[in-house]
């Protein structure tokens, strides 16, 4: 019995269906086929869980969190014992193993390993201003998403004709900050932060209005 090489790793967007491949060759009939799918979750590497089991011509549920979401892609028994996981969750990220036994065929490699990473688009970020908006001050524009796998990068833009930040601005696309030094009335305007990762983007808006000093009456 020989389980075919797996692609190594699979990436899927949260909520979509993942197909975990596992095929094998055997010299024996599939009368005594026994297939166990296991996962070692990334979030809890010390706690392997059963995903689904095929034994004695019957299918059995694995861990409760997979109930109703997991099944074999084809009619069993078969030499293609790939499984699907519907409505993938972040907690489904981990290393999956298919363990195949088909007596009396013994020997050879009977385990296939596939990594699954569930990707999450950035949630809409939170935009805020840190610092005084008085003319001549320094301000920091802050942008961060609560969710996003891989970790989002952040791009600030000023929504004028150029989409360019003021010349006194410095941007950190990893932290999501823009520091604008010595703000002037020209700094005023609507700013948009775009949070991006491999599978999506999201945005937030911030209206920065620089406050000019009021003329003082000299009596």
């Amino acid at each position: 019995l020989e389980v075919s090489e797996s692609p190594g790793s699979i990436q899927v967007a949260r909520g979509q269906t993942a197909v975990l491949p596992c095929t094998f060759t055997t010299s024996a009939a599939l009368i005594n086929l026994n297939v166990i799918w296991m996962v070692t979750p990334l979030s809890n590497a010390n706690q392997p869980e059963q995903v689904i089991l095929y034994q004695g011509g019957q299918m059995f549920d694995g861990a409760p969190r997979f109930h109703g979401r997991v099944g074999f892609t084809g009619t069993m028994p078969a030499t293609n014992v790939s499984v699907f996981i519907n409505n993938t969750q972040l907690s489904d990220t981990g290393t999956y193993q298919c363990l195949v036994n088909n007596l009396p065929d013994i020997g050879g490699r009977n385990i296939g390993v596939t990594g699954l990473t569930v990707l999450v688009p950035p949630s809409a970020p939170h935009c805020q201003i840190q610092g005084s908006q008085d003319i001549g001050s320094d301000v920091i524009l802050l942008c961060s998403s609560e969710e996003g796998i891989p970790r989002p990068t952040y791009l600030w833009e000023k929504l004028d004709n150029t989409l360019k930040l003021p010349p006194t601005a410095t941007q950190d696309q990893v932290q999501g900050t823009v520091t604008i030094r010595n703000i002037s009335t020209l700094t005023s305007g609507l700013y948009q932060c775009v949070a991006s990762n491999a599978i999506g983007t999201s945005t937030c808006l911030l209206d920065l209005q620089v406050i000019s000093p009021q003329p003082r009456n000299i009596g």
Partner: antibody, heavy 121, light 107 residues
Framework: EVQLLESGGGLVQPGGSLRLSCAAS????????MSWVRQAPGKGLEWVSA????????YYADSVKGRFTISRDNSKNTLYLQMNSLRAEDTAAYYC??????????????WSQGTLVTVSS | DIQMTQSPSSLSASVGDRVTITCRAS??????LNWYQQKPGKAPKLLIY???SLQSGVPSRFSGSGSGTDFTLTISSLQPEDFATYYC?????????FGQGTKVEIK
């Protein structure tokens, strides 16, 4: 009480121009960004343009960019929309709307009653 | 641009009914969502801002919920004055965009 009163709507030929005005009262006009939103007959709402409280920053929907100009006169508490090169698809009721300030930019909390602009030959 | 999709486009209901309107954004918009009511020949009126906050003066039978991409406007017990068209609107990104509207009619 916040009030927004429009004027300037009417019938205009394709390629023509029109200027809408919106007189504001009941709040400190210069403290609020203002916007224009339109609604074609029997259709939904479409944001057209916005302007900051000071008037220094203006924003437009792609559909009107280069043809429409938003402006304001804070001494007169009045918002304007200059519409040039008008097209049949600009036919709509035009509303001026006050926008919440700061981090709530983009929320229209008070609206005018609307003025109808008809572009037809 | 962020697309906003409302469902249903119209519904018929009776006074006293509980009515639910949904709005879906084409990308996550967090809670940057507003709901408006518009009666025929009238200007829109802000009902709910920030997805779930009731605008001052709006009856408590109106409520909003949701975050991310899926949002709901609920009228707990429909009153005669509630027959109107309802619009959702996102303020997460530019340009500001509205849903196509949901018309609530008398059954």
């Amino acid at each position: 009480e916040v009030q927004l009163l429009e004027s300037g709507g009417g019938l205009v030929q394709p390629g023509g121009s029109l200027r809408l005005s919106c007189a504001a009262s009941g709040f400190t006009f210069s403290s609020y960004a203002m916007s224009w939103v339109r609604q074609a007959p029997g259709k939904g709402l479409e944001w057209v343009s916005a302007i900051s409280g000071s008037g220094g920053s203006t924003y437009y929907a792609d559909s009107v960019k280069g043809r429409f100009t938003i402006s304001r006169d804070n001494s007169k508490n009045t918002l304007y929309l200059q519409m040039n090169s008008l097209r049949a698809e600009d036919t709509a009721a035009y509303y001026c709307a006050r926008m919440a300030a700061g981090a709530s930019w983009g929320t229209f909390d008070y609206w005018s009653q609307g003025t109808l602009v008809t572009v037809s030959s | 641009d962020i697309q906003m999709t409302q469902s249903p486009s119209s519904l018929s209901a009776s006074v006293g009914d509980r009515v639910t309107i949904t709005c879906r954004a084409s990308q996550s918009i967090s809670s940057y969502l507003n709901w408006y009511q518009q009666k025929p020949g009238k200007a829109p009126k802000l009902l709910i801002y920030a997805a779930s906050s009731l605008q001052s003066g709006v009856p408590s039978r109106f409520s909003g919920s949701g975050s991310g991409t899926d949002f709901t406007l609920t009228i707990s017990s429909l009153q005669p004055e509630d027959f109107a068209t309802y619009y959702c609107q996102q303020r997460s990104g530019s340009p500001l965009t509205f849903g196509q509207g949901t018309k609530v009619e008398i059954k």
